[in-house]
């Protein structure tokens, strides 16, 4: 199949990297700068993908594959692909039409994308809140109050840094 | 995962005219060329159509070149084959299929696409 198809179509015999010029007789040329094929037989290359503005290059065009790009420091990628670029906020924010707002008390956001996310509510669970939230961090659960016997703490007290009587070195 | 869907097929009179869409979801569409294939009822698979990734260069099969149109829209992540004046040889199942990152072959053979939809049948009878 290949072969008869090549014997009616010289296009086929031209190769990634280069086009079928139909101006100089379908001999296969180059494709151009800034142009690739990355299969045999185009009849023109396809231009190359460009990283303007917040985009950054990735990965530099080259004759037979598309430049790939990604986003300049200060924003992060959207979209498969890397299609759009969205500014990045500070932990314990998120980004809104008006620009990177806090995150309100009860959500926090530990990383520079995304929403701000409600706290775990500890008792759904049947457990307390050992650690409490804030706009960087969500809390943290322990044990229930009824696994705690009385007076027994919750937290186990750092160990001392040296023991107590002896002068530092 | 990568998934091609198509529709927009159905029964036509010679001379009518359809248009076949191919809804991609699951990777970056934008990024890939696309083309369209046929296989027609006990014949083997035939090239028909294929786009660059932006949309700014095609290329087309004799048979259909002044007939079909294929464009897409990377905003919706849709291939779509606009086909007139359409002829009882048309009668085929289309296929959608996306090309390759790169590929030793040529755009008219199969092994240069490597996910495809499960196709969308077009009937021209009088």
């Known amino acids: 199949f290949e072969r008869t198809r090549s014997l009616q179509d010289p296009c086929s015999n031209c190769p990634a990297g280069t086009f079928c010029d139909n101006n100089r007789n379908q001999i296969c040329s180059p494709c151009p700068p800034n142009s690739f094929s990355s299969a045999g037989g185009q009849r023109t290359c396809d231009i190359c993908r460009q990283c303007k503005g917040v985009f950054r290059t990735r990965k530099e065009c080259s004759s037979t594959s598309n430049a790939e790009c990604d986003c300049t420091p200060g924003f992060h990628c959207l979209g498969a692909g890397c299609s759009m670029c969205e500014q990045d906020c500070k932990q314990g924010q998120e980004l809104t039409k008006k620009g990177c707002k806090d995150c309100c008390f009860g959500t926090f956001n530990d990383q520079k994308r995304g929403i701000c996310r409600p706290w775990t509510n500890c008792s759904l669970d049947g457990k307390s809140v050992l650690v409490n939230g804030t706009k960087e961090r969500d809390v943290v659960c322990g044990p229930s109050p009824a696994d705690l016997s009385p007076g027994a703490s919750s937290v186990t007290p750092p160990a001392p840094a040296r023991e107590p009587g002896h002068s530092p070195q | 995962e990568v998934q091609l869907l198509e529709s927009g097929g159905g029964e036509v009179q010679p001379g009518g005219s359809l248009r076949l869409s191919c809804a991609a979801s699951?990777?970056?569409?934008?990024?890939?060329?696309m083309a369209w294939f046929r296989q027609a009822p006990g014949k083997g698979l035939e090239w028909v159509a294929r786009l660059a990734w932006n949309g700014g260069s095609t290329d087309y099969a004799e048979s259909v070149k002044g007939r079909f149109t294929i464009s897409r829209d990377n905003a919706k992540n849709t291939l779509y084959l606009q086909m007139s004046s359409l002829r009882a040889e048309d009668t085929a199942v289309y296929y959608c299929a996306r090309q390759r990152s790169y590929s030793r072959y040529d755009i008219r053979t199969p092994q240069t696409y490597d996910y495809w939809g499960q196709g969308t049948l077009v009937t021209v009878k009088p």
């Open positions: 699951g990777w970056a569409f934008g990024n890939y060329g």
